[in-house]
């Protein structure tokens, strides 16, 4: 994360959504990797 971005109030107010989005994209990446791995 960009540390300077955290001074923006928006970052604080969206933190939960940002974390949710991060978790979701990590989950999607893991699933994608699993599909690739399974196809090998």
């Amino acid at each position: 994360d960009n540390p300077s971005l955290s001074i923006d109030l928006t970052f604080h107010l969206l933190r939960t959504l940002l974390e949710l989005a991060r978790t979701q994209s990590q989950r999607e990446r893991a699933e994608q990797n699993r599909i690739i791995f399974d196809s090998v």
Epitope: N2, L5, I7, F11, A21
Partner: antibody, heavy 118, light 112 residues
């Protein structure tokens, strides 16, 4: 000083798309989220969405989801808002805005009038 | 969505006299961090909105001290102690505590 300069007025036909730009200066573009707000004649201000210019995370107001696309070009310190499937009710002034550590909309662009008319 | 209701819709004022605008939220806008993200904006004719007050009662830099904000929970007020000609325009309250962020319908301050 912080400046947000938006692109000029647009006239579009129903069903078309419009892309409005917002060039930021006077601060490090990637340090602050950029928001988009619109003001239709006689209507209240409406928050449309917000982008994290650093990592590209975008959050939309559900009301506009599917029709609005917010992007950014960090090398040009510019944010963009594209609205598709335009209808007459989309006739409005569109603003970009930036917050601070204390408030959400501390600095505003000059606004871009988008007129949707057949 | 949190509905922000302002009153009055129109506020005829006499220059030099006080003015007061009310803003009510449809639900509490106290954020989970215990702060209340209630802001007030002024929009002069033909101009972009301008931030006046943040977090209920804090004046933004450069805002004259004749402007003050108060309130809590669901009930908020913007006061102008002595209205000046440059204060004419539309005033909006805004809540940033809940997504989607929402604005009030506006109060037009005009000469009586």
């Amino acid at each position: 000083q912080v400046q947000l300069v938006q692109s000029g007025a647009e006239v579009k036909k129903p069903g078309a798309s419009v892309k409005v730009s917002c060039k930021a200066s006077g601060y490090t573009f990637t340090d602050y989220f950029m928001k988009w707000v619109r003001q239709a004649p006689g209507q209240r201000l409406e928050w449309m969405g917000v982008i994290n210019p650093n990592q590209g995370d975008i959050f939309y107001n559900q009301k506009f989801k599917g029709r609005v696309t917010i992007t950014r070009d960090t090398s040009a310190s510019t944010a963009y808002m594209e609205l598709s499937s335009l209808r007459s009710e989309d006739t409005a002034v569109y603003y970009c805005a930036r917050g601070t550590d204390r408030a959400l909309f501390a600095y505003w662009g000059q606004g871009t009038l988008v007129t949707v008319s057949s | 969505d949190v509905v922000m209701t302002q009153s009055p819709l129109s506020l005829p004022v006499t220059l030099g006299q006080p003015a007061s605008i009310s803003c009510r939220s449809g639900q509490s806008i106290v954020h989970s961090d215990a702060n209340t993200y209630l802001e007030w904006y002024q929009q002069r004719p033909g101009q972009s909105p301008r931030l006046l007050i943040y977090k209920v009662s804090n004046r933004f830099s450069g805002v004259p001290d004749r402007f003050s904000g108060s309130g809590s929970g669901t009930d908020f007020t913007l006061k102008i102690s002595r209205v000046e000609a440059e204060d004419l325009g539309v005033y909006y309250c805004f809540q940033g505590s809940h997504i989607p962020w929402t604005f009030g319908g506006g109060t037009k301050v005009e000469i009586k």
